[in-house]
Amino acid sequence: ESGYAQNGDLEDAELDDYSFSCYSQLEVNGSQHSLTCAFEDPDVNITNLEFEICGALVEVKCLNFRKLQEIYFIETKKFLLIGKSNICVKVGEKSLTCKKIDLTTIVKPEAPFDLSVVYREGANDFVVTFNTSHLQKKYVKVLMHDVAYRQEKDENKWTHVNLSSTKLTLLQRKLQPAAMYEIKVRSIPDHYFKGFWSEWSPSYYFRTPEINNSSGEMDPI
């Protein structure tokens, strides 16, 4: 089952043979940081390929990545987090390609969690709250959050709200009555640190009340 169909290999010209991308996660396990890299081209034969990071490290000159299936991973306290590191793809002692990267510019936050929605009957609104592990962190504390919600029947019609706090109010009149909604949230660094969106939180599902219906707190489904 290996290889592509007889109608030709997959030739996407924008992919270099050894193009790769990485993201860092700071204080992801206590005071330990992590760095995860992977090749962009899904057709690269990674059998003998290794990754190495050199520079902007504490006490050591270089560190080798561990290969986990088809990604490459380091967990360490030794990132200086000042200046650029050189990340190289290697086969044996030979470097095939390298990138100079400041690890503070490729931060991917941890996904938010404990997302919930409570209906306030008197206020005719929904209070959305969630949690993030970054409130307790020393480095990546300031995040921008993207709350996305949709009526469950609308496959791709997401409404997005950006906010810096972990609480959002949705007005009942802005939502359809007696409808099932899905809501989720993700985060991105927003001060000094730069990088990528986190993974989405697990979705939370809630139903809006009928018009003129006293239903109290919204129960999760």
Epitope: E1, D12, A38, F39, D41, P42, L68, E70, I71
Partner: nanobody, 117 residues
Framework: QVQLVESGGGLVQPGGSLRLSCAAS????????MSWYRQAPGKERELVAS????????RYADSVKGRFTISRDNARNQLYLQMNTLKPEDTAVYYC??????????WGQGTQVTVSS
């Protein structure tokens, strides 16, 4: 153990669209290059599209380039295939699996796509 559950197939007219989904479990999805394969009656299974672990690199068979889009959601262990401008020759059972298959890898039940007027 590894489980792959494909869905979203159906009967569609030429020129139509479908979106296939694959729910993966039993392995670390976010660490794997993932692919969609298809098998037409009387033909060998062929590789249709592949996507890198982070979702930032993709490859497509010549026959589907510009019409199919592979994507993934690592938070939900889901793989997708958006199929536009479908042709009768796209008729097949579609399967998702790892790009680099191991001897022990099982296949899901697949999802049937039929393109016919």
């Amino acid at each position: 153990q590894v489980q792959l559950v494909e869905s979203g197939g159906g009967l569609v007219q030429p020129g139509g669209s479908l979106r296939l989904s694959c729910a993966a479990s039993g392995f670390t999805f976010s660490q794997r290059i993932m692919s969609w394969y298809r098998q037409a009656p009387g033909k060998e299974r062929e590789l249709v599209a592949s996507i890198s672990p982070f979702g930032d690199g993709t490859r497509y068979a010549d026959s589907v380039k510009g019409r199919f889009t592979i994507s993934r959601d690592n938070a939900r262990n889901q793989l997708y295939l958006q199929m536009n401008t479908l042709k009768p020759e796209d008729t097949a059972v579609y399967y998702c699996n790892k790009r680099n298959l191991e001897i022990s890898d099982d296949w899901g039940q697949g999802t049937q796509v039929t393109v016919s007027s």
